[in-house]
């Protein structure tokens, strides 16, 4: 709390501008009117206030509005935003893409902080879902954003939203979240033709089904090692050599390098050592010629 | 470029004046706060003065306040500091710097002009 | 407020991890940076509001810390990191910087 004092003579502030730059915390509080101050935010992002002085303007501001700023301060609220408490803004109506635009403009270059989280899921929820542009604005700022939704949060995210997904904004995606994802992308892109639907659809592939696989197999999409390490371990396992092979086309010879890493290894030990020979890459722990393969869930379902 | 030159330095008996310049390039100089950063010989850092983007308003440390004022020129694009009453421990490098538009760290210092005082 | 900057000097190597911790008498948010001196030369900003990478600046530069103390992390020195690092708080007037902390080659 800053104790009230009486504004000196001549203090008083007529408008918010650089006269107050070196204003003592006590001659802000005194001279500077709350009222004057909302009305005039945007220019305190002109001037440069020490972060004490920072927390009394944010303080007359809080005395003004107890309830929450209104949007018309939100949207200018500038450097000021960086001193707002996640509590502060959880009173918030936050609309405008304008003014979430304006508040991330002010923390770029900062980890997302517990404010901004705050900030981003009061104006998701205010919108009842992830739209396009909401979305677009998310992922320029914070290309981590999408990975950061629980599979939950993710499935109220429109299949026209996927569009403005770009391959780096699913870097951290785990399985759960690309079993989300791609359904929608796969939706998303349907009517684009084969070699441009591979092209989208490739960073959402970790969380493709077996069968759309073995479809990606016979479209001659030469799938690179980067992309097929990420797939589904239980998407892979079925998928026979013939088909691995059509799947990544020059790049099946990456095999050798990945053997001992899942998917690969896990493959491997499905997949008969006959076959694997075909490949001519030395691929080692098939199943042996003349070994039977039996499939016990297959037995367990039909039991 | 974005640039800042400072001029003026040198040596002056303790008791007498200098006037200090420092030319800035390649940023629109009014919109901008400026100070003045000197460092004693083989010492740290010490924020001497500051004025505001206008020139209106200003601020001195306690060691140099009624001896030094700081001032603009927005058409020449200069900031200045008239140094009077010089003593032995004001020798030191003054650096020119540039602070963000909403903040006081600086992006952008001048290579500094060596004020010695001594008799 | 005074900032106390600790160690005054230490020596390293190249590829060493150096850390570089920054006290302030009394609590200034975040509102703390970091800058590089070189001999003969002007200060160079590494980190601004205690945490955010100054832009150009190698990522092997990293800042932390709130309140009262902070920390400049180099991961990796690297030979043209031999130089005399400050701190400096933007909290409240008047500005004032620590003492600095010399890194010399071991």
């Known amino acids: 709390e800053v104790e009230k004092t009486a504004c000196p003579s001549g203090k008083k502030a007529r408008e918010i501008d650089e006269s107050l730059i070196f204003y003592k915390k006590w001659e802000l509080e005194a001279c500077v009117d709350a009222a004057l101050l909302a009305t005039q935010m945007d220019r305190v992002n002109a001037i440069p206030f020490t972060y004490e002085q920072l927390d009394v303007l944010k303080h007359k501001l809080d005395e003004l509005y107890p309830q929450g700023y209104p949007e018309s301060v939100i949207q200018h609220l500038g450097y000021l935003f960086l001193k707002m408490s996640p509590e502060d803004i959880r009173k918030w109506n936050v609309t405008s893409l304008e003014t979430l635009k304006a508040l991330l403009e002010v923390n770029k270059g900062h980890e997302m902080s517990p404010q901004v989280a705050t900030l981003i899921d009061r104006f998701v929820k205010g919108r009842g879902q992830l739209d396009k542009d909401t979305l677009d604005t998310l992922t320029a700022f914070y290309p981590g954003y999408l990975c950061s939704l629980s599979p939950e949060e993710l499935s109220s995210v429109p299949p026209s939203s996927i569009w403005a997904v770009r391959p780096q904004d699913l870097d951290t995606c785990d399985p759960r979240q690309l079993d989300v994802l791609y359904p929608k992308a796969r939706l998303a892109f349907q009517n684009m033709n084969g070699s441009e639907y591979f092209v989208k659809i490739q960073s959402f592939l970790g969380g493709a089904p077996t069968e759309d696989l073995k479809a990606l197999s016979q479209q001659n999409v030469s799938m690179d090692l980067a992309t097929f390490m990420k797939l589904r371990t239980d998407a892979v396992l079925p998928l026979t050599v013939a088909e691995v092979q059509k799947l990544l086309g020059p790049h099946v010879e990456g095999l050798k390098a990945e053997e001992r890493h899942r998917p690969v290894r896990d493959w491997i030990l499905r997949q008969r050592q006959d076959d694997l020979d075909t490949l001519g890459l030395g691929l080692q722990g098939g199943i042996p010629n003349g070994y039977l393969v039996l499939d016990l869930s297959m037995q367990e379902a039909l039991s | 470029e974005v640039q800042l030159l400072e001029s003026g330095g040198g040596l002056v008996q303790p008791g007498g004046s200098l006037r200090l310049s420092c030319a800035a390039s390649g940023f629109t100089f009014s919109s901008y706060a400026m100070s003045w950063v000197r460092q004693a010989p083989g010492k740290g850092l010490e924020w001497v003065s500051a004025i505001s983007g206008s020139g209106g308003s200003t601020y001195y440390a306690d060691s140099v306040k009624g001896r030094f004022t700081i001032s603009r020129d927005n058409s020449k694009n200069t900031l200045y500091l008239q140094m009077n009453s010089l003593r032995a421990e004001d020798t030191a490098v003054y650096y020119c710097?540039?602070?963000?538009?909403?903040?006081?760290?600086?992006?952008?210092w001048g290579r500094g002009t060596l004020v010695t005082v001594s008799s | 407020i005074q900032l106390t900057q600790s160690p005054s000097s230490l020596s390293a190597s190249v590829g060493d991890r150096v850390t570089i911790t920054c006290r302030a008498s009394q609590g200034i948010s975040s509102a703390l940076a970091w800058y590089q001196q070189k001999p003969g030369k002007a200060p160079k900003l590494l980190i601004y509001?205690?945490?955010s990478l100054e832009s150009g600046v190698p990522s092997r530069f990293s800042g932390s810390g709130s309140g009262t103390d902070f920390t400049l992390t180099i991961s990796s020195l690297q030979p043209e990191d031999f130089a005399t690092y400050y701190c400096?708080?933007?909290?409240?007037?008047?500005?004032?910087f620590g003492g600095g902390t010399k890194v010399e080659i071991k």
């Open positions: 710097a540039k602070g963000r538009r909403f903040s006081w760290y600086f992006d952008l």
């Open positions: 509001d205690a945490s």
């Open positions: 400096q708080q933007f909290n409240n007037y008047p500005l004032t």
